[in-house]
């Protein structure tokens, strides 16, 4: 376990070999989750890229946060995709949080502390626990089949995950840098493996 506080993973160039694999202590399937993270890239007006890829053996896009060029954020659960449009692209560090719950299918998507309109996806579904969680690449199969044109070029950090839906107050606290206790992925006690050309550097966001 490593305390990654105030650090970020840096992916300096496009590749299909560089990634970070995150280890999560999941023992049972997820009926809800929240993922929060920071990232920083210049790619958004050029092409799509993967931000957070969680694959199981039955479904490579079990959870996927992806930037889709000309549209905005693509969020996938269990292979089903919804879009959160971003009308104007700016090059700046971004903080996102997204949550999903099986009981209602409700998805929340927060960008820099501001909520988007809630949407619905995969009501009644359960997310598999035996997962390959990858930063920097989009998995087209469990733990692999990466395509360079979907890779992240830039920085990513503060990746935290919970097995429940955070309240708006809690998401606001996280965005403002307040205290929190993630129970699936914890950036302050991170188990991970680096493959290829990935560097750990001080974070560039406040």
């Amino acid at each position: 376990q490593t305390d990654m506080s105030r650090k970020a993973f840096v992916f300096p160039k496009e590749s299909d070999t560089s990634y970070v694999s995150l280890k999560a202590p999941l023992t049972k399937p997820l009926k809800a989750f929240t993922v929060c993270l920071h990232f920083y890239t210049e790619l958004s007006s050029t092409r799509g890229y993967s931000i957070f890829s969680y694959a199981t053996k039955r479904q490579d896009n079990e959870i996927l946060i992806f930037w889709s060029k000309d549209i905005g954020y693509s969020f996938t659960v269990g292979g089903s995709e919804i879009l959160f449009e971003v009308p104007e692209v700016t090059v700046a560090p971004v903080h996102i949080c997204t949550s999903w719950e099986s009981a209602s299918g409700i998805v929340e998507f927060w960008v820099d502390g501001k909520p988007r309109v809630r949407k619905s996806l995969k009501k009644g579904y359960t997310v598999g626990a035996e997962a390959s969680i990858i930063l920097g690449q989009e998995q087209d199969s469990f733990g692999g089949n990466f395509e360079g044109s979907q890779s992240l070029v830039g920085d990513i950090g503060n990746v935290n995950m919970w097995d429940f839906v955070l309240s708006p107050d809690e998401i606001n606290t996280i965005y403002l840098g307040g205290p929190f206790s993630p129970n699936v992925l914890n950036w302050r006690a991170l188990k991970y493996e680096v493959q290829g050309e990935v560097f750990t550097k001080p974070q560039l966001w406040p």
């Epitope: 799509g48 896009n61 060029k69 292979g79 995709e81 989009e138 087209d140 979907q150």
Partner: nanobody
Framework: EVQLQQSGPELVKPGASVKISCKAS????????MNWVKQSHGKSLEWIGN????????IYNQNFKDKATLTVDRSSRTAYMELHSLTSEDSAVYYC????????????WGQGTLVTVSA
Amino acid sequence: EVQLQQSGPELVKPGASVKISCKASGYMFSDYYMNWVKQSHGKSLEWIGNVDPNTDNTIYNQNFKDKATLTVDRSSRTAYMELHSLTSEDSAVYYCARSRFYDPWFAYWGQGTLVTVSA
């Protein structure tokens, strides 16, 4: 459920152009290349080319480089193929089919669009 829904049949005059569409649903659009295939009457299938919806990059069969233009509209999850300077040789059924970048086969196909070139 994965579906590729193509536009309806077209009757066009020689020398004209035609643009046919393929609307995708039931999967992450950016994750698969969209291929186009020609089937002329009594002939085997010919691969025209593909487009990567993630980057807009295209790859063409050299035989169709000046005949077809492949594009995508991500917001509507639709792929398009425009055929130029049509002749009777271009009369055929045209199919869209999706593939992963590493797959040599196409698991899902559209229903086909019949293009008839006639004066």
